[in-house]
């Protein structure tokens, strides 16, 4: 076996086990794990007399190394005295020595918890010019503690006079603060608060977190839009993965079907974001019939920074079905904007929430970018509603003053569409509606208890309409209000107009 220096441990009794009238006590020192023999153990007993006895070395069976115990028996005023056991092992080195200083007995104590806290970054997430580290030494039995700060394992020259100790009940807490320059903190060094207490060492370390803490990768899987499903008859589903570290293509998106049948060829798109992450979308064409019949599709995402693959699945929404109600209206002329008008479309009480909204002019569908449509939101009942807004120009309405708001939804019959026509100047052009009864469109005037129905043929007073105070679930601007036509013998219907 090669030369090995000893590990040295003090051997003491518990103070509570020593009779208060004891005139002499024995303590010891264990030197273990050394090779070869011998070790020399000497004692410093201070002003007290003592007798020592070193036991013969024993061989540790597994390693072949040696262990020995030296015992010291002292008499007199031993309670307040500290004793030093000095172990020398010349085979390791002529000057190899380990000293252990300790008292006759060990008291029961609660060891401290050591925790380093650090000051916050500024509001922009940047480090301030100086960084404070606070070492909290808490919950220990009151007694002497020594705090040392280390930088990469080297003792730092720190003013420890600022350390403060408080006592709560039977336990004490101490805290020590270290102030670092930003340069030191950013240099990736490790800072350690080391606490010595009752002959034991406790510590906590910290350093600036690495730049490369992986952010949370998220994956989302969309259902096909009703427009793609029922009108274009070429539905697709999209798996969207965001906040990826851009590892040059190591993100894998794999499609599968619950039925085990093969999937179509998917198309993949990658987009680099300004926050340094990658967004990956994979679009999979699905069969209209497969989707309607309830097939489940799965997207599996693997990436080096994911501890395990992300799985997302999608299928046709289950539950009750309800066709949408569609109401369209035009805002009145606004001073200063005579050549532009806003058309609005409220689509409500449909289930499930998947819906596509389109605007048509001259039998031509307008590009999606022309209109803005809210996400479906729940109504007070069990259905959903959306609101769509379209800006039109004078040139458009002078060419043909009829614009159609169309909703595509699976519960709409006969052809999964419901639409409503609206005119900028309703007195000049009639609106038309398909797939549902067209209730009278009512314009309410604020302060009036009754409104005026606006039918193609002209204006007739309408006694069964009153202005409400606005619907809580209506996302539009505050001047929009709700009229309720309390039609006899029919369920009341609501329409949102200007009051």
């Amino acid at each position: 076996a090669s030369t090995q220096s000893p590990s040295v441990f003090p051997l003491t009794r518990c103070c509570k086990n020593i009779p208060s009238n004891a005139t002499s006590v024995t303590l010891g020192c264990l030197a273990t794990g050394y090779f070869p023999e011998p070790v020399m153990v000497t004692w410093d007993t201070g002003s007290l007399n003592g007798t020592t006895m070193t036991l013969p070395a024993t061989t540790l069976t597994l390693s072949g190394h040696y262990a020995t115990i030296s015992l010291l028996t002292v008499s007199g005023a031993w309670a307040k005295q500290m004793f030093t056991c000095r172990v020398a092992h010349t085979p390791s080195s002529t000057d190899w020595v380990d000293n252990k200083t300790f008292s006759v007995c060990s008291r029961d104590f609660t060891p401290p918890t050591v925790k380093i806290l650090q000051s916050s970054c500024d509001g922009g997430g940047h480090f301030p010019p100086t960084i404070q580290l606070l070492c909290l030494v808490s919950g220990y039995t009151p007694g002497t503690i020594n705090i040392t700060w280390l930088e990469d394992g080297q003792v730092m020259d720190v003013d420890l006079s600022t350390a403060s100790t408080t006592q709560e009940g039977e336990l004490a807490s101490t805290q020590s603060e270290l102030t670092l320059s930003q340069k030191h903190w950013l240099s990736d060094r490790t800072y350690t608060c080391q606490v010595t207490y009752q002959g034991h060492t406790f510590e906590d370390s910290t350093k600036k977190c690495a730049d490369s803490n992986p952010r949370g990768v998220s994956a989302y899987l969309s259902r096909p839009s009703p427009f793609d499903l029922f009108i274009r008859k070429s539905p697709t589903i999209t798996c969207l993965v965001v906040d990826l570290a851009p590892s040059k293509g190591t993100v894998n998106l794999t499609w599968s079907r619950a039925s085990g049948k093969p999937v179509n060829h998917s198309t993949r798109k990658e987009e680099k974001q300004r926050n340094g992450t990658l967004t990956v979308t994979s679009t999979l064409p699905v069969g209209t019939r497969d989707w309607i019949e309830g097939e489940t599709y799965q997207c599996r995402v693997t990436h080096p920074h994911l501890p395990r693959a992300l799985m997302r699945s999608t299928t046709k929404t289950s539950g009750p079905r309800a066709a949408p109600e569609v109401y369209a209206f035009a805002t009145p002329e606004w001073p200063g904007s005579r050549d532009k008008r806003t058309l609005a479309c409220l689509i409500q009480n449909f289930m499930p929430e998947d819906i596509s909204v389109q605007w048509l002019h001259n039998e031509v569908q307008l590009p999606d970018a022309r209109h803005s449509t809210t996400q479906p939101r729940k109504t007070k009942g069990s259905g959903f509603f959306v609101f769509s807004r379209l800006e039109v120009t004078r040139a458009e309405w002078e060419q043909k003053d009829e614009f159609i708001c169309r909703a595509v939804h699976e519960a709409a019959s006969p052809s999964q569409t419901v639409q409503r026509a609206v005119s900028v100047n309703p007195g000049l052009a009639g609106g038309s509606a398909q797939s549902q009864r067209a209730p009278d469109r009512v314009l309410c005037h604020s302060g009036q208890q009754q409104g005026l129905p606006r039918a193609a043929g002209g204006s007739v007073p309408h006694p069964r309409c009153h202005c409400g105070a606005g619907r809580a679930d209506w996302p539009g601007p505050p001047e929009l209000d709700v009229c309720v036509e309390e039609a006899e013998g029919e369920a009341p219907w609501t329409w949102t107009g200007l009051c």
């Epitope: 730049d211 490369s212 570290a245 851009p246 190591t250 680099k272 300004r274 920074h305």
Partner: antibody, heavy 119, light 107 residues
């Protein structure tokens, strides 16, 4: 601390092959890609290709396609770059570099390996 | 491939000077631009990534900015250890491409 240590300098005859190694330490090897970048004497930096230490996927510069192979050995956290049919204009210092997480920079570099191609 | 045009190709400056190096890209790369410093006989070292984010441990006298397809590396007060060659690199599309370098020499 992240370290990339490359193999020593090589002198090769035209038409020969060279294999440069790059041993990584101080981070989880399979969580990052390794790129190889070369620099001819007195010239700028040229990206040669990339390999994923995660799954071995590769992406090579078009001008080197067919002559270059990149591999990894995850058991030793080592990346290799093999360049065949060497020409005199392949004389350069070859660097391996780790691909950083966000914005894909080369955040840590090996010390470089000088490969001299001469008859 | 995206072309990177760095200017100037070299400059002479004194300790304490403010130094600016620019890099223009042939097409939009968002802010996916990185700056490196290389000293003779040594490997390049990453200074700035994402156009303006300082790598941990890099002195704060280095800063980066962007304006469309123009990117700037600024050394606010040149130190003796800053005399080196600086390269810009785009990581927006494959292959990643580097500028031809700017050598900062002692005046």
């Amino acid at each position: 601390q992240v370290h990339l240590v490359q193999s020593g300098a090589e002198v090769k005859m035209p038409g020969a092959s060279v294999k440069v190694s790059c041993k990584a330490s101080g981070y989880t090897f399979t969580s990052y890609g390794i790129s190889w970048v070369r620099q001819a004497p007195g010239q700028g930096l040229e990206w040669m290709g990339w390999i994923s230490a995660y799954n071995g996927n590769t992406n090579y510069a078009q001008k080197l396609q067919g002559r270059i192979t990149m591999t990894t050995d995850t058991s030793t956290s080592t990346a290799y770059m093999d360049l065949r049919s060497l020409r005199s204009d392949d004389t350069a210092v070859y660097y391996c570099a780790r691909d950083g997480d966000y914005y894909d920079p080369f955040d840590y570099w090996g010390q470089g390996t000088l490969v001299t191609v001469s008859s | 491939d995206i072309q990177m045009t760095q200017s100037p190709s070299s400059l002479s400056a004194s300790v304490g000077d403010r130094v600016t190096i620019t890099c223009r890209t042939s097409q939009s790369i968002s802010n996916w631009l990185n700056w490196y410093q290389q000293k003779p006989g040594k490997a390049p070292k990453l200074l700035i990534y994402g156009a303006s984010t300082l790598k941990s441990g890099v002195p704060s006298r280095f800063s980066g900015s962007e304006s469309g397809t123009d990117f700037t590396l600024t050394i606010s007060s040149l130190q003796p250890e800053d005399f080196a060659t600086y390269y810009c690199q785009q990581s927006y599309s494959t292959p990643p491409t580097f500028g031809q370098g700017t050598k900062v020499e002692i005046k």
